[in-house]
């Protein structure tokens, strides 16, 4: 199956080049998308590419600059957020990030009405997160760990927290390992839908072991990085939820929100807070031991000004195969009653499906169901459920968006995008605008990326938004590579992989083959997208063929393949990858003396795995900033999947499914190991530790490792990785250079 | 020369509403925002409220917040204010005002150009 | 809201003279970012409008003679007219653009003694 814009004649083909490195290196065939930022139910907002913030509204086809292009520039502006009442803009600068999600900024504010900066009152610096009230113009804040209310912004600022402290106590954002492996996000405040009153959460990290890492900097002596990081079985942030009327928030203060007696009994987490209305809210909880999970609905209490949670609203979510939810415990979306709800978990057959829940979670009514998995619930209106899954021709690697009329009995059911541009686009999301009066779709691929504008209620395209043109003609004298995604059925498992192939790939030719493998619980690999990126380039220049390959513990294809990995990480995964290389090496094409494997993060750990796995496939393999023991990685993701590493639960598993232990299994392989001095997330100690062991075995191997950079090796960095890397395979292969 | 011509003089009834006009020339309308203020008998200056031009938005002083309409029309390069629920106490002259839009962090900018006035006159 | 006080409510100046004029903001009018006084002065003759004299506490608009001149800075600011001239005597105002709601000081009138 050829998933890439068709190709010229032969006659043309010798105009044609082959993709560069520094192709890659530069972004020459990056593609750009369009999100609408949405302000009403026709009207959005964009950045031109003059960088003027311009309103456009859909339904009489007008546009105006909203913020000048002159105002931007003269503080430096990267990012920008109009008020509700479309009286002031905050305008975001100084951006420094911190970790995944995190960063600081300074925020002006520019009032619309006066053609002028606020200049009374002004925010503090540097500043945490902000973010306006979903009515008006009153801003929250976090500032050093505490958080703080305007009512308007140049209004005095209310303090709501005093006790927030540099990694001892968060407010209003979370702390490392939430951040991170929980909420996704870098706040952890809520408004309610009218903006009376805000919740927010606390994270205490007092008693959290601390990671501390060397910044070499350029100082004389380097700095030393202090995080809060709870690894696999050690002590956890302790989590409390507090709401405050933002409209008397002197008046009672901020009121705790009880967690559920069955969470509350041990150890548990937060998983997400969600308004229903300004005087219902719904909490999210999860025992420690991540296979249940509790969603609570919590009104408020006039009378006592206090917010209650009857047991009568709390519904459980348990998984007796695996851990609950997929990679994270869905969140739900309510329907316009205000009590029932919407929300994606496993049905009997073991499929992630749309449930409606009006009482009790046992009397759902599934909405969606099959042998696919319905992805994200984008929008639910008075007459339609948006949504994506991937069941079209049973493709798990796609995305279309699809509507079901829940106004009407029968429910039916419509793909929106199935049709759409079949051959370009099978790789969708979606952006609504609010009551879903209208939507952007943007499509991924396998084609160039386009987004387009449509009707909600009829679906009927409006506008095309962005068709990447530019990046359509650089490629048009490109010999891109081919690709295709199959699947191979091997002891009652599917595998599907997709295969990038050299321009000129002829069967009866051998090529050298390198595995590209991620492999997390819950990830998928094989994608309809389109990408011209490093193993394009491998692909495309030095002929190479690229696999990827989704195994056990990979997402949207049913629980079975998803929690095959539970409590066993490590293991099926890396058999999964070897057995579709025998499979390839079948095909007839690979050269099975020039095989290779790479991965990062994950990957990484996956990759060595399978390195060191003594099948004797492999010639050579990277690990970039792999996990090596699962004892080194966060709690909260780690024991999601392992339990704990004690001896009553799962230590066992954790020490046999290190990297180390298999450290004399990679005396007949060449290994190249990278890792970031600086990384937070996956720390040094993990290739550090690897590098020690294979010493110990007195096993030669390659390593490089980047000073001061984190997971993402970005920057300069980033080049001289793909180009070391490159040398590296180049080397394995026999290439020349 | 920059001009803001104003409506003319007024008289209503208490509970009645007033719209006056401020027509502007000789500038780029789009560059100024446009302030009204009023001045009671023997009273200081009072600022009602201003709009900028380009989105229309208006803001208004809290204590006028509710029976204050401030618009433009910016094709004809004209500014209103309209005062509903008018009382005795709102007899005054009315005056528009522009005042630069400040695209810089570092600027800001005082009324330099002023309507010539409208007297309101409210009386039963 | 900022609160604007003039003193004196009204001062007698011989022709050629010179006449003081003070005004006091409730809240700094200093801008920490720019180091400039978001202070305006106006002149007010009988039966027209004002007319915007200084800006930024002690800048000249365009065309007003040189005999105003306008200092201070922070809360306390001084309009000073070096020499009296008979189409001086109006009312004069000081006026804060620092923040919303913009607000006036009650007037100074100035004659002639």
């Known amino acids: 199956i050829v998933l890439r814009p068709s190709r010229v004649h032969n006659s043309e083909e010798n105009t044609m080049r082959a993709l560069t490195l520094k192709d890659i290196l530069n972004g020459t065939f990056s593609y750009k998308t369009f999100f609408p930022n949405w302000i009403s139910g026709q009207e959005y907002l964009h950045q031109s590419a003059d960088n003027n913030i311009v309103l456009y509204n859909i339904e009489t086809g007008q546009s105006y600059t909203i913020l000048s292009n002159r105002t931007m520039k003269s503080v430096n502006a990267s990012n920008y957020g109009l008020s509700p009442d479309r009286q002031f803009v905050y305008l975001e600068s100084d951006y420094s990030k911190l970790w995944r999600y995190s960063y600081t900024a300074t925020y002006y504010i520019y009032d619309l009405s006066n053609g002028e900066f606020v200049r009374g009152n002004e925010l503090p610096r540097p500043i945490q997160y902000l973010c306006w009230s979903p009515v008006g113009s009153k801003l929250a804040y976090v500032y050093q760990n505490n958080i703080y209310l305007k009512q308007r912004p140049g209004d005095p600022p209310f303090q709501i927290t005093f006790n927030g402290r540099e990694n001892k106590i968060f407010n209003g954002i979370p702390d490392w390992v939430y951040e991170e492996e929980m909420l996704a996000t870098k706040y952890a405040l809520w408004w309610s839908p009218n903006g009376k009153f805000l919740a927010y959460a606390e994270f205490n990290d007092t008693d959290i072991p601390v990671i501390a890492y060397s910044y070499y900097g350029d100082e004389q002596y380097p700095r030393t990085i202090n995080i809060p990081y709870p690894k696999a079985g050690a002590k956890n942030p302790v989590v409390r939820i507090f709401i405050i009327d933002t409209t008397y928030p002197a008046y009672v203060g901020p009121q705790e929100v009880p967690v559920p007696a069955m969470i509350a009994s041990s150890d548990y987490y937060f998983s997400w807070l969600t308004w229903v209305t300004d005087e219902r809210v719904c909490l999210q909880w999860l025992k420690r031991v991540q296979n249940v999970s509790v969603l609570s609905i919590c009104d408020f209490r006039e009378d006592w000004q206090t917010w209650d949670c009857p047991k009568t609203q709390e519904h459980i979510e348990e998984s007796r195969t695996g851990w609950a939810g997929g990679f994270f415990v869905s969140t739900p979306v309510f329907s316009y009653d205000a009590i029932s709800y919407y929300k994606i978990f496993s049905d009997k057959d073991g499929y992630k499906h749309i449930h409606y829940i009006k009482d009790t979670v046992e009397n759902a009514i599934q909405i969606t169901s099959g042998k696919w998995e319905a992805i994200n619930i984008f929008r639910v209106t008075q007459d339609s459920l948006f949504y994506s899954s991937n069941e079209f021709e049973e493709y798990p690697g796609r995305r279309n968006i699809y509507r079901i009329s829940i106004g009407s009995y029968p429910p039916s059911k419509k793909c929106v995008t199935c049709h759409l541009r079949k051959e370009r686009c099978q790789y969708y999301t979606a952006s609504f605008s609010d009551y879903a009066k209208y939507y952007a779709l943007v499509c991924y691929g396998p084609g160039i990326p386009i987004s387009t504008l449509h009707d909600g209620r009829t679906d009927q395209e409006i506008k095309i938004l962005e068709e990447n043109k530019e990046l359509e003609n650089a490629l048009k004298n490109i010999q891109l590579p081919k690709e295709e995604i199959k699947k191979l059925e091997v002891d009652e498992i599917t595998l599907w992989y997709k295969m990038i192939l050299p321009p000129q790939f002829d069967r009866s030719k051998k090529y050298p083959l390198l595995i590209q493998v991620y492999g997390g619980p819950c990830s998928q690999s094989v994608r309809s997208v389109f990408a011209v990126n490093w193993i394009s380039y491998l692909a495309s220049k030095e002929g190479m063929v690229i696999a990827l390959v989704d195994g056990r513990g990979t997402a949207f294809q049913g629980d079975k393949l998803l929690y095959a990995v539970y409590r066993k990480l490590g293991v099926y995964e890396v058999e999964d990858q070897i057995t579709a290389v025998r499979k390839f090496i079948e095909m007839g094409f690979i050269d099975e003396k020039r095989i290779a494997i790479w991965g990062w993060s994950y990957g990484g750990y996956v990759s060595s795995l399978a390195l060191a796995s003594g099948t004797g496939l492999f010639k050579c393999g990277i690990a970039v900033a792999p996990v090596s023991s699962w004892e080194y990685y966060a709690s909260v993701y780690t024991e999601r999947f392992m339990g704990l590493p004690t001896k009553d639960d799962n230590l066992e598993h954790y020490k046999n499914s290190t990297v180390m232990a298999r450290a004399e299994y990679f005396r007949n392989v060449d290994y190249l190991l990278i890792h970031g001095t600086a990384d937070d997330n996956v720390h040094f100690q993990n290739s550090a530790q690897i590098a020690k062991a294979l010493v110990n075995a007195q096993v030669d191997f390659q390593a490089m490792w980047y000073s001061d950079q984190n997971h993402g090796l970005s920057g300069l960095s980033t080049n001289h990785l793909y180009t070391h890397m490159t040398h590296f395979l180049k080397q394995c292969f026999s290439l020349s250079d | 020369q920059v001009q803001l011509v104003q409506s003319g003089a007024e008289v209503k009834k208490p509970g009645a509403s007033v719209k006056v006009s401020c027509k502007t020339s000789r500038y780029t309308f789009t560059e100024y925002t446009i302030h009204w203020v009023r001045q009671a008998p023997g009273q200081r200056l009072e600022w009602i409220g201003g709009i900028n031009p380009n989105n229309g938005i208006p803001n208004y002083n809290q204590k006028f917040k509710g029976r204050v309409t401030i618009t433009v029309d910016t094709s004809a390069s004209t500014a209103y204010m309209e005062l509903s629920s008018l009382r005795s106490e709102d007899t005054a002259v009315y005056y528009c005002?522009?005042?630069?839009?400040?695209?810089?962090?570092?600027?800001?900018?005082?009324?330099?150009?002023w309507g010539q006035g409208t007297l309101v006159t409210v009386s039963s | 809201d900022i609160v604007m006080t003039q003193s004196p409510d009204s001062l007698a100046v011989s022709l050629g003279e010179r006449a003081t004029i003070n005004c006091k903001s409730s809240?700094?009018?200093?801008?920490?970012?720019?180091?400039?006084?978001?202070l305006a002065w106006y002149q007010q003759k009988p039966g027209q409008p004002p007319k915007l004299l200084i800006f930024w506490a002690s800048t000249r608009e365009s065309g007003v003679p040189d005999r105003f001149s306008g200092s201070g800075f922070g809360t306390d600011f001084t309009l000073t007219i070096s020499s009296l001239q008979a189409e001086d005597v109006a009312v004069y105002y000081c006026q804060q653009y620092f923040s919303y709601p913009l607000t006036f000081g009650q007037g100074t009138k100035v004659e002639i003694k």
């Open positions: 005002a522009r005042r630069r839009i400040a695209y810089g962090y570092d600027e800001g900018h005082a009324m330099d150009y």
């Open positions: 809240e700094s009018l200093l801008y920490s970012r720019n180091q400039k006084n978001y």
